[in-house]
């Protein structure tokens, strides 16, 4: 018979032969042959593999570093990675939760809609037309553009969501 060019699900092609993949939680020791099945071994303590695989090494469980404010939310198994979270009152910097911050800041162009609490992080909102924020802040709202008219001045440079308007003197030359 012709050697296969593709294999079924949970199999892989090697040496013109379809071998079974190792199940999650196990790593590959040796490929199958005409006469033997794929040989797999369970991952060791603090290791995991979360898919059907042909990996020769298991992945290390994530370390929740207490020096970064992290603690274990869910202990890893041979099939799943450890899930970290932040100490109470702190917030993850990303979905992967690799480090913790007291609260995040709102970037220039955004203002603080709600200041962080122990439970919820800072909520930012974009500065609407007529407002700006030129700083990164965890408490400052968007500021309204300066009203040149009330100072008997004119707008020399338009404002943006990150910059205030620039006012200048009225043009004295009037027709």
């Amino acid at each position: 018979p012709e050697p296969p060019t593709a294999c079924r699900e949970k199999q892989y092609l090697i040496n013109s032969q379809c071998c079974s993949l190792c199940q999650p939680g196990q790593k590959l020791v040796s490929d199958c042959t005409e006469f033997t099945e794929t040989e797999c071994l369970p991952c060791g303590e603090s290791e995991f593999l979360d898919t059907w695989n042909r990996e020769t090494h298991c992945h290390q469980h994530k370390y929740c570093d207490p020096n970064l404010g992290l603690r274990v939310q869910q202990k890893g198994t041979s099939e799943t990675d450890t899930i970290c979270t932040c100490e109470e009152g702190w917030h993850c910097t990303s979905e992967a939760c690799e480090s913790c911050v007291l609260h995040r800041s709102c970037s220039p162009g955004f203002g603080v809609k709600q200041i962080a609490t122990g439970v919820s992080d800072t909520i930012c909102e974009p500065c609407p037309v007529g407002f700006f924020s030129n700083v990164s802040s965890a408490f400052e709202k968007c500021h309204p553009w300066t009203s040149c008219e009330t100072k008997d001045l004119v707008v020399q440079q338009a404002g943006t969501n990150k910059t205030d308007v620039v006012c200048g003197p009225q043009d004295r030359l009037r027709a």
């Epitope: 911050v101 800041s105 965890a138 408490f139």
Partner: nanobody, 116 residues
Framework: EVQLLESGGGLVQPGGSLRLSCAAS???????EMWWVRQAPGKGLERVS?????????YYADSVKGRFTISRDDSKNTLYLQMNSLRAEDTAVYYC?????????WGQGTLVTVSS
């Protein structure tokens, strides 16, 4: 290496005053937004007060409004918290924090105990 060193805490009677200081080193202090945060025994973190990098904007939690004043002296790389009319519920460890507020730049804090 960023270092924040809080001082000025102690035992004070209700109605009394204290001035906390936070000495900053390892970064250019001027221009950084700064916060005072506290943690009462067995409680979570409470954001007390903040000051903008320019010193022009401030924030106070409702629980301290009218009693506490935040200020900064950029020439001394120091943040202050003047606490007046202290109450028993102000008892806590007080920490200062700098943007971006990472855990590893957290100081040791200074303990304020308000008791008669």
């Amino acid at each position: 290496e960023v270092q924040l060193l809080e001082s000025g805490g102690g035992l004070v009677q209700p109605g009394g005053s204290l001035r906390l200081s936070c000495a900053a080193s390892g970064f250019t202090f001027a221009g950084y937004e700064m916060w005072w945060v506290r943690q009462a025994p067995g409680k979570g973190l409470e954001r007390v007060s903040a000051i903008s990098g320019s010193g022009g904007s401030t924030y106070y939690a409702d629980s301290v409004k009218g009693r506490f004043t935040i200020s900064r002296d950029d020439s001394k790389n120091t943040l202050y918290l003047q606490m007046n009319s202290l109450r028993a519920e102000d008892t806590a460890v007080y920490y200062c924090a700098k943007e971006p507020y990472s855990f590893d730049s957290w100081g040791q804090g200074t303990l304020v105990t308000v008791s008669s």
